[in-house]
Interface confidence: medium
């Protein structure tokens, strides 16, 4: 059956933790991605931003997991109005910002 939202969020958080904790060099060679608003629709926005990073195996699992939270199909080059399209940040910072926000949501019981 479908994975409970709390379990899916916990698994996503654990993958983000895994990525941040295991960095020995700049993540994805320091690739830059568009910053996003960490509000409603952030899962799709996060995926739209990260999907434009290619050749970075470290975030492939995160990309797959985010697709499970996003109701529509996302492809490279696709952007929604949720993006703050004037700011680019390193993938490492993007992942960490997302991690901190999701941990807050989990603590507050906001699983969807």
């Amino acid at each position: 059956g479908p994975v409970p939202p709390s379990t899916a969020l916990r698994e996503l958080i654990e993958e983000l933790v895994n990525i941040t904790q295991n960095q020995k060099a700049p993540l994805c060679n320091g690739s830059m991605v568009w910053s996003i608003n960490l509000t409603a629709g952030m899962y799709c926005a996060a995926l739209e931003s990260l999907i434009n990073v290619s050749g970075c195996s470290a975030i492939e699992k995160t990309q797959r997991m985010l697709s499970g939270f996003c109701p529509h199909k996302v492809s490279a080059g696709q952007f929604s109005s949720l993006h703050v399209r004037d700011t680019k940040i390193e993938v490492a910072q993007f992942v960490k910002d997302l991690l901190l926000h999701l941990k807050k949501l989990f603590r507050e019981g906001q699983f969807n």
Partner: antibody, heavy 122, light 108 residues
Amino acid sequence: QMQLVESGGGVVQPGRSLRLSCAASGFTFRTYGMHWVRQAPGKGLEWVAVIWYDGSNKHYADSVKGRFTITRDNSKNTLNLQMNSLRAEDTAVYYCARAPQWELTAEAFDIWGQGTMVTVSS
Amino acid sequence: SYVLTQPPSVSVAPGQTARITCGGNLIGSKLVHWYQQKPGQAPVLVVYDDSDRPSLIPERFSGSNSGNTATLTISRVEAGDEADYYCQVWDSSSDGVVFGGGTKLTVL
């Protein structure tokens, strides 16, 4: 309220053993990772060991590996540290501490016990 | 294993701002926690996850973390803030906790 109380400290000769205990109350013990942290007189904090919430994983500082064993009894809300082959450099205040836990990493220590003093001396 | 470097001491006048640093390789990618310890007492968590504060900790305590340095900032310092402060991270390479050496904050 949420509380951790250590016991079992004392004076022991080098090479001997000692068992520390930590009694937890006021929270759901079985859902938290538990740690031991020590502090030698006049020195900084040194992490000693962690045991996962369900006891499935245990990790130790290199300085105590092979000599110390961390265990827990979730039915009794207790954490233990069996210390064997004690050395003078193990002299310290030993704190137990609680840490919320993800699968791969510990969180911050949000509750600490008051500490119990262990002195290793001949 | 992972190493965290703190200055041994920081001095500040009452009412001023104290900044305590914690250096580590790519520490900005890790989650940093800070503890306050007064003489004869157990440590107390003052900042977790880089910049979050436990509910009982005053807003004067804040944290930041990027690059190779994490910083604990204490604004409008009071005499009661005099203590030792420790940063801490989880080191995945050793599956253990790492503390910085500690910084003694002196309020002049």
